[in-house]
């Protein structure tokens, strides 16, 4: 019958020639009178046989990524008489794995939003490597993820690739980050191969600014000869969030004398001063009026950043007509 | 510290000409209105004009208008007085006087500069 | 023209006393807008109260103003010797006018 122990070859190596093992006949006492074949995908160009002893070699660098097992077949012939002296059998050389593929992400680029102020903890995104080594063969593929670039705000759960935010971050003083992890095999023993992706992760607007007037005091003036309607001029104040969150209302806080009231145009964000009554410079020639604004959606849980609507002083000047 | 000085003052005859002036320090003059008070010998006080903190509106007290002439001059963060046709009755201490912000009240005043009409 | 009467037009008291001085006006102050100053004999006059009853920079709390409308008050609780001079009240609701002044001396 035949003799051989199973058939292993390191993949990637150097040498013109490499003794995988033998393949031999119990009945073969050694004396040169039988001759081996081999026969197969491989067999004379990966792989040979020397004829006489049965020693298989490697002839090839392999690459177990590329293929990671050879069905051969082998044959005993008796020199003498030309037949058979086992019937033909199938075997198989396995190439072991050896950590030469460093991990890689495959579905970069990267990117995920998630909104300001998020608690530490919050789920931002997970990021996948793979290792073309064996998964079986020790720790060639088993991964490790870390972050080179995003401290404090961000950390990786080593084993998930899993990104939380660990620093709440304010979408006021920075929009974006760029975060850099690295997945490192062999659980970052000597040896390690790693790969690194960059995640962009955005930070969405939430309401946590309050609009603040640009100035703590506007002049402006107003014919006696305005009718009421009259837009007598705007007032401004700046919001840091976005979008929605930006929008605001204006509104009187005090006027004594009930003669202006403030509309807010939505398309601007702009308050324009409305005359709600004549004036006559004779009787009063300038009001003082204080103005407030607000946002226009602050949700419940948003409403300690809201408290205290910025305000305003308004002196308005009522301007002289000469009566006939 | 605000300060407000005034000069210019001096013994002039009635018809005649005299200018004001009012250097201002310590603040942002180009942001506050100001005004011109005045205190005829051992009397009240009396409003005599405004102007703007831009220098584009300017009142006047019925008993200077068309004589009176407040002007200022943000480069020189100077406010001045010019006084035409000047009468008797306009014989004071003239002050300067910085309007409040958030507010028509003076919280500043210059020392004055006394202005005698005479023959 | 808003007209500011003040009286009494001279308040002769002791250090330590209270002063009560009133100002009336010939209608309706809008918004309180109204100012006490006080002036000390050769020197310019200096802001006491305005809005009616605010009290402004620096002044001690011994000073305070009330009032509304046509009538208002500045009240001195307990005079120091600085305290002696003339008081004026100012409306600033229609133009700028004040009081002919209430000299407070000391007894």
């Known amino acids: 019958g035949w003799v051989w122990n199973q058939f292993f070859v390191p993949e990637e190596m150097n040498t013109t020639s490499h003794h995988i093992g033998q393949l031999r006949s119990d009945l073969d006492n050694g004396n040169n009178s039988f001759q081996y074949k081999l026969l197969g995908a491989g067999a004379g160009s990966t792989f040979i046989i020397d004829e006489r002893t049965g020693d298989i070699y490697a002839i090839q660098k392999l690459d177990r990524e590329e293929r990671s097992l050879y069905i051969l077949r082998a044959q005993v012939i008796d020199i003498a008489t030309g037949r058979a002296v086992e019937p033909e059998s199938e075997f198989v050389i396995k190439v072991s794995d050896i950590n030469d593929n460093e991990p890689k992400f495959l579905d970069e680029p990267y990117e995920a939003i998630v909104p300001e102020m998020s608690p530490e903890g919050t789920l931002v995104i997970q990021v996948t490597a793979s290792d073309a080594d064996d998964p079986s063969s020790g720790n060639n593929a088993r991964l490790l993820y870390s972050l080179l670039q995003g401290q404090p705000y961000f950390s990786v759960e080593p084993t998930t690739g899993v990104i939380r935010i660990s620093s709440k971050m304010d979408r006021e003083l920075q929009d974006e980050y760029w975060v850099i992890i690295q997945a490192k095999d062999m659980i970052g023993q000597p040896g390690a191969l790693s790969g690194t992706t960059s995640v962009l992760i955005k930070l969405s607007d939430v309401n946590d600014n309050k609009p603040i007037f640009k100035e703590s005091l506007y002049r402006l003036t107003v014919s006696e000869s305005a009718p009421t309607g009259t837009s007598i001029g705007t007032i401004m104040a700046y919001d840091n969030d976005i979008g929605e969150n930006a929008e605001m209302d204006y509104s009187i806080e005090e006027d004594d004398s009930q003669t202006f009231d403030i509309i807010t145009n939505h398309e601007t964000q702009e308050g324009i001063v409305i005359l709600k009554k004549k004036v006559d410079f004779e009787h009063q020639n300038h009001y003082g009026i204080r103005a407030k604004v607000k946002n226009h959606h602050v949700p419940e849980q948003l409403m300690k950043y809201h408290t205290e609507a910025s305000t305003t002083f308004i002196k308005i000047q009522v301007e002289d007509v000469d009566e006939p | 510290q605000v300060q407000l000085v005034e000069s210019g003052g001096g013994v002039v005859q009635p018809g005649r000409s005299l200018r004001l002036s009012c250097a201002a320090s310590g603040f942002t003059f180009s942001s506050y209105d100001m005004h011109w008070v005045r205190q005829a010998p051992g009397k009240g006080l009396e409003w005599v004009a405004v102007i703007s903190y831009d220098g584009t509106n300017e009142y006047y007290a019925d008993s200077v208008k068309g004589r009176f002439t407040i002007s200022r001059d943000t480069s020189k963060n100077t406010l001045y007085l010019q006084m035409n046709s000047l009468r008797a009755e306009d014989t004071a201490v003239y002050y300067c006087?910085?309007?409040?912000?958030?507010?028509?009240?003076?919280?500043?005043w210059g020392q004055g500069t006394l202005v005698s009409v005479s023959s | 023209e808003i007209v500011l009467t003040q009286s009494p037009g001279t308040l002769s008291l002791s250090p330590g006393e209270r002063a009560t001085l009133s100002c009336r006006a010939s209608q309706s102050v809008s918004n309180t807008y109204l100012a006490w100053y006080h002036q000390r004999p050769g020197q310019a006059p200096r802001l006491l109260i305005y809005g009616a009853s605010s009290r402004a920079t620096g002044i001690p709390d011994r000073f305070s103003g009330s009032g509304s409308g046509t009538d208002f008050a500045l009240t001195i609780s307990s005079l120091e010797p600085e305290d002696f001079a003339v008081y004026y009240c100012?409306?600033?609701?229609?133009?700028?006018?004040f009081g002919q002044g209430t000299k407070v001396e000391i007894k």
């Open positions: 006087a910085r309007e409040r912000y958030f507010d028509w009240s003076f919280d500043y």
């Open positions: 100012q409306q600033y609701s229609n133009s700028w006018t």
